[in-house]
């Protein structure tokens, strides 16, 4: 299928003018190749018209131009002047056009209507509103005020100024007759339809003196926007329906094949399941706008949305709506999602999120995605280090390996972490891409106590066992802050022969600080890993105390009991600033771990590698 | 969920070259970090090599840096490890994995033997 993209149908109106913009995808090649727009023959050629290239064919000379607009992945023509002879069968395209690299165009110019002299033109989209203005003369001041409806030769009465009101328009028309002075009554239709459409007659009075004033009213469906995505990527639908619906529920539906409207996801907590984990309602603002995001584009999203407003939540006539056609290009650069990273409870995941590789200054995020309500999805960790709290010490997100890939380790697994993440940046928001966290059966491979407590001054000992298949990995402690996990000084490089045969069931790298020191309380991680790729992670909490008894602990996984309820936290808690991504309000804002400042390191930690029975080891 | 079949494996004398193919099946492999891993027999199954879902980064094992390379081709659904200068202590079954440094989906290894 061609990744050309265009309307598929333009009408208009003989005089006026028309603007096409065909989508392409913006590769270096596509950006500099010949665009055209030509006009289907009854042979099948097409003859351009117009080209990027400066060609103008004669019937268009003068009135029509195509412009490129190689940044966006955009070419958009101009015609002006239009005819009834310009209505036929068009295609937009790169190269030359006989390839293929197209997209089908109808356009359509009717005659405009012919319409009384005098006749004041309202041109309002379905389901808005439309205030039909009519004058009058002092003599008919108090006489009857009426609007009719010209159906043929006949005019059938819509309101007056006794009270009526025809029922095709009951609970959405008013007629307004201003105070004294002023030789103006107006009638306002609310959610307007596409059967209001026609000609109407305001009159005020009766016989031969009365006043009448002609008023077309053209309801339009709105003409839909034309969204053009990667596959694998992620849209942005923008709503604004106005004030007058701003208390109502809001929804986003897809036209389906019987031109019935599937609700995708509304205000009133419904969703399509084929939505989940990639779908977003924004929070609305005071105007009742609100959007919604879908990552993880598929080729079947492609198709016509439309938001409305209604009580029921679903679309309804005469309510107000906006249309889109989403197009999702299949030539894409952005990875496949969602992927799934299995982990055991109590263990760990080090998810891998990939980025755009030319942004790779941009700010990294991993929010969580929650399916209550409308979706949202409050982030838990970002690049400059913030940390919601309810992730201290399991949570921190690495800009390695780089180049297109940031790393992000949560550990202390549990069920409750089952679900979906989104990865993002401050960048390309194209780049949302989901991850959905498993919890399988299974015991965690690395083993730390859950809980140690260490004595000011004295020396401190903590083991993390490993199994025999992570010899050939590296191993590491780290001391965790909010702003990453920072790694602790070893005593040697490179496993040793005896290390790496791995004959014993179990092997062991121990974290040793001494002396211990009030700045030592807080959390470690013992973790392997493979350069800049990131491995399996165990956590421990350190307690520091006073010294109450002299010698050096040594702590055996034995002691080993729940991690404490009470974490010693910073007081300066600030909320997340939203910045990751261009709307704001995304992500609920949470509070975050300030940063704890100091850090464990010098020569007093060292970590020590060795196996279970040789606790002098020295590899790492 | 992914399924990985590995290919090329075979004899090969010291010295010698060889190209290991891993297809996989399944829509989300190119989200996927891939690795390669082996197992000598009697051995535990050791780490390879390791590459992002651009290509954009890759790990070696120190036992094969310089000689062995992964890649990938998204648009075939493939990651390949070449390996160069082969060595009899290269001699064990390969094994592809997807999101290796997680709970990694396996293939069912193909078998290399470096003849001396």
């Known amino acids: 299928k061609s990744p050309v993209f265009g309307p598929q149908e333009v009408s208009s109106v003989e005089g006026n003018s028309v603007s096409i913009k065909c989508y392409y995808p913006p590769t270096s090649v596509n950006r500099h190749t010949r665009k055209y727009w030509c006009r289907k023959g009854a042979s099948g050629r097409c003859i351009t018209l117009v080209s990027s290239e400066g060609y103008v064919s004669s019937n268009y000379a003068g009135r029509a131009n195509l412009t490129n607009f190689p940044e966006n992945g955009t070419f958009v023509v101009n015609i002006a002047q239009l005819s009834r002879d310009d209505s036929g069968h068009y295609k937009c395209g790169l190269g030359i056009n006989s390839r293929g690299l197209s997209f089908d165009v109808s356009l359509e110019v009717s005659q405009g209507p012919e319409l009384p002299n005098g006749t004041e033109v309202y041109t309002v989209d379905v389901g808005r509103t439309v205030t039909i203005k009519c004058p009058f003369k002092t003599e008919n001041a108090p006489k009857t005020k009426a609007l009719y409806k010209k159906i043929g030769q006949t005019s059938v009465l819509v309101i007056d100024s006794r009270n009526y009101v025809n029922p095709n328009y009951k609970d959405r028309i008013r007629l307004r007759i201003p105070g004294t002075g002023q030789l103006i009554f107006t009638v306002v239709i609310d959610r307007l339809r596409l059967s209001d459409h026609g000609l109407y007659l305001c009159q005020a009075g009766d016989g031969s003196n009365r006043d009448e004033k002609n008023a077309d009213l053209q309801v339009l469906e709105p003409e839909p926007e034309l969204v053009y995505e990667d596959l694998r990527g992620s849209v942005t639908f923008h709503c604004a329906l106005g004030l007058e619906v701003a208390n109502v529920a809001k929804f986003l539906c897809r036209v389906n094949s019987r031109e019935t409207c599937d609700v995708v996801i509304n205000t009133l907590g419904k969703r399509d399941s084929a939505f989940e984990g990639r779908i977003l309602l924004n929070p609305q603002d005071k105007d009742g706008s609100f959007s919604v995001v879908i990552t993880g584009l598929r080729k079947e999203d492609e198709g016509r949305y439309l938001c409305g407003a209604h009580s029921d939540g679903q679309l309804q006539e005469g309510w107000p709506i906006q249309a889109w056609q989403l197009f999702v290009n299949e030539e894409s650069t952005i990875p496949r999602s969602p992927t799934v990273v299995k982990g055991v409870a109590g263990g760990s995941v080090a998810v891998l999120c990939p980025y755009n590789p030319k942004e790779s200054q941009s700010l990294k995020y991993w929010c969580l995605w929650e399916g209550a309500q409308n979706g949202r999805c409050p982030l838990l960790v970002e690049s400059q280090g913030l940390v919601q709290e309810q992730y201290e010490g399991r949570l921190s997100l690495l800009q390695e390996p780089g180049n297109g890939t940031f790393t992000v380790i949560l550990n202390q697994l549990t069920t409750q972490d089952a679900g979906f993440y989104w990865c993002l940046t401050n960048g390309d928001t194209r780049w949302r891409t989901t991850v959905e966290i498993k919890i399988i059966e299974g015991e965690p491979n690395l083993k730390v106590p859950g809980n140690v407590t260490a004595v000011l001054g004295e020396t401190l000992n903590i083991p993390c066992h490993f199994p025999c298949k992570f010899s050939s990995y590296e191993k590491y402690w780290c001391k965790w802050s909010n702003t990453g996990c920072q790694t602790l000084p070893s005593q040697d490089e490179g496993p040793s022969e005896a290390f790496v045969n791995c004959d014993e069931n179990s092997r062991l790298v121990s974290l040793t600080l001494n002396p211990v020191t009030r700045a030592d309380e807080g959390w470690y991680w013992c973790g392997v890993k493979q350069g800049h790729f990131y491995g399996e992670t165990a956590a421990v909490y350190v307690a520091v105390e006073e010294k109450k008894v002299a010698g050096s602990r040594y702590v055996s996984p034995a002691k080993a009991d729940a991690a404490p309820d009470e974490k010693v936290l910073d007081s300066g808690v600030r909320e997340i600033e939203n910045k990751a991504i261009q709307d704001p309000r995304l992500f609920a804002e949470e509070k975050v771990v300030a940063d704890t400042g100091d850090q464990a390191g010098g020569s007093r930690a060292s970590v020590d590698s060795s196996s279970s029975e040789e606790q002098g080891g020295s590899s790492k | 969920q992914v399924q990985l079949v590995e290919s090329g494996g075979g004899l090969v004398q010291a010295g010698g070259s060889l190209r290991l193919s891993c297809a996989a099946s399944g829509r989300t492999f190119s989200s996927y970090a891939m690795g390669w891993f082996r197992q000598a027999p009697g051995k535990e199954r050791e780490f390879a090599a390791v590459?992002?879902?651009?290509?954009?980064?890759?790990h070696y094992a120190d036992s094969v840096k310089g000689r062995f390379t992964i890649s990938r081709d998204n648009a075939k659904n493939t990651v390949y490890l070449q390996m160069n200068s082969l060595k009899p202590e290269d001699t064990a079954v390969y094994y592809c994995?997807?999101?290796?440094?997680?709970?990694?989906?396996w293939g069912q290894g193909t078998q290399v033997t470096v003849s001396s």
């Open positions: 590459i992002t879902w651009n290509g954009g980064s890759t």
């Open positions: 994995a997807a999101d290796p440094m997680n709970s990694p989906y």
